[in-house]
Interface confidence: medium
């Protein structure tokens, strides 16, 4: 029996700069029951606060309401570790909520065949911002990236779009099903996941018109 | 606890070239943006470079624009600085270090290597 | 470039006085954002830097409360309230609001 491992923060991320959780390894137990508690503090500002929310988030985790949340202040964050035998602490972690936004896939994936007038076939792929994204305001700046592969086939073709929520994919092979995904990421922060799988089938013979 | 171990330095004449490596432990290496800072004999420091922590983004002032390149290994933990055309004025003390924010923000390099020597000179 | 000048250049002090330092940008050094990243730097003999203060004011961890930093748009101040002897060294004054990131000179905090 020993005091417990240090334990480390994971990651940190929010899903819109208005509210964030982070995550934390245990470190060892040291063979006796541990409890762990998150600590806090804002630059500036002498105070400590524990952990408004062990539970919405999961194990091993903190989550951070509205009412909690600030932007363009550094959150210094540490994990404490504690049982019969002592108790250690991670290393504190400095948090910018601005620069941790891992959004929530786009929606409304849509996807439709279309013609140009030379009888050129193309995929017109369009959608939307994730719902809590406030793109129209500049609260928010996304970039995009689309993906797609024959339905069979292993290896997805990834376009990157800009800030473009529409993109126009030619040279298709005819007869052919297509799967189809898009991700978003802020201009600070990470890539959503892929959204939901969209498919079309390309047509062989081609006889509608734009 | 956050180690950076810089190596990579020596002695080259004028016109070579140079690659300085610093292998980071003791916290997510991919998390964090990178910098590397030269101080010369004078004693005054220079930033040299940084690079985000995906290493799609990279910067460099003027003095050392297309001739250093820095970059990383993620899945290695380290973090590099090709020097090229190297020049007497390059001779330095060579740091890297880590931004203290995760993930993004600015400056506040929070920890410090102890420094690789670079002498440039025939 | 923002060019960052500090003075005094060399400080001599007594141990258990206070010591300022003054670091002034050449222009603002707020950033688009709001913010200022304006650093304090100490470098201890045959040492590397270590970080003091971030963002005009904020104490990096561990670093003691003797340690307050000030000042705003150009003009910023690092105080030491009582001057410890492992205080000694080369205090410098970093901006990391736009790029090119520069350093000022160095302060040489000295025993008198």
């Known amino acids: 029996q020993s005091p417990p491992g240090k334990p480390e923060i994971h990651k940190c991320r929010s899903p819109d700069k208005e509210t964030f959780t982070c995550w934390w390894n245990p470190g060892t137990d040291g063979g006796l029951p541990t409890n762990y508690s998150l600590t806090y503090s804002k630059e500036g500002e002498k105070t400590t606060y524990e952990c408004p929310d062990y539970k919405t988030s999961g194990p091993n985790s903190c989550f951070f309401s509205k009412q909690y949340t600030s932007i363009w202040k550094i959150y210094i964050i540490t994990v404490n570790a504690t049982n019969q035998m002592g108790s250690s602490s991670s290393d504190p972690l400095y948090v910018d909520v601005t620069y941790i936004v891992e959004p929530e896939p786009p929606r409304n994936l849509t996807l439709e065949v279309k013609q140009l007038k030379d009888k050129k076939t193309y995929l017109w792929v369009k959608w939307s911002p994730p719902t809590i994204t406030d793109v129209k305001t500049g609260w928010f700046t996304m970039e995009y990236e689309i993906r797609l592969k024959p339905e069979e086939a292993e290896e997805w073709e990834i376009h990157f779009t800009g800030h473009q929520t529409q993109f126009k994919v030619f040279d298709l092979y005819p007869g052919q099903k297509y799967l189809v995904q898009t991700r978003c990421k802020p201009d600070h922060g990470y890539w959503s996941r892929w959204s939901q799988e969209s498919s079309v089938e390309m047509p062989n013979d081609f006889t509608l018109k734009d | 606890e956050v180690k950076l171990v810089e190596s990579g330095g020596g002695l080259v004449q004028p016109g070579g070239s140079l690659k300085l490596s610093c292998a980071a432990s003791?916290?997510?290496?991919?998390?964090?943006?990178m910098f590397w800072v030269r101080q010369t004999p004078e004693k005054s420091l220079e930033w040299v470079a940084y690079i985000s922590n995906g290493g799609g983004s990279t910067y460099y002032p003027d003095t050392v624009k297309g001739r250093f390149t820095i970059s990383r290994d993620n899945a290695k933990n380290t973090l590099y600085l090709q020097m090229s055309r190297l020049k007497s004025e390059d001779t330095a003390m060579y740091y890297c270090?880590?931004?203290?924010?995760?993930?993004?923000?600015?400056?506040?390099?929070?920890?410090w290597g102890q420094g690789t020597s670079v002498t440039v000179s025939s | 470039d923002v060019l960052m000048t500090q003075t005094p250049l060399s400080l001599p002090v007594s141990l258990g006085d206070q010591a300022s330092i003054s670091c002034r940008s050449s222009?603002?050094?707020?950033?688009?954002?709001?913010?200022?990243?304006l650093e304090w730097y100490l470098q201890k003999p045959g040492q590397s830097p270590k970080l003091l203060i971030y963002?005009?004011?904020n104490r990096f961890s561990g670093v003691p409360d003797r340690f307050s930093g000030s000042g705003s748009g150009t003009d910023f101040t690092l105080k030491i309230s009582r001057v410890e002897a492992e205080d000694l060294g080369v205090y410098y004054c970093f901006q990391g609001s736009h790029v090119p990131f520069t350093f000022g000179s160095g302060t040489k905090l000295e025993i008198k």
């Open positions: 222009q603002s050094i707020v950033h688009s954002n709001g913010n200022t990243y």
């Open positions: 270090s880590r931004q203290l924010f995760y993930y993004g923000s600015r400056g506040a390099m929070g920890y």
């Open positions: 963002k005009v004011s």
């Open positions: 003791g916290f997510t290496f991919s998390d964090y943006y």
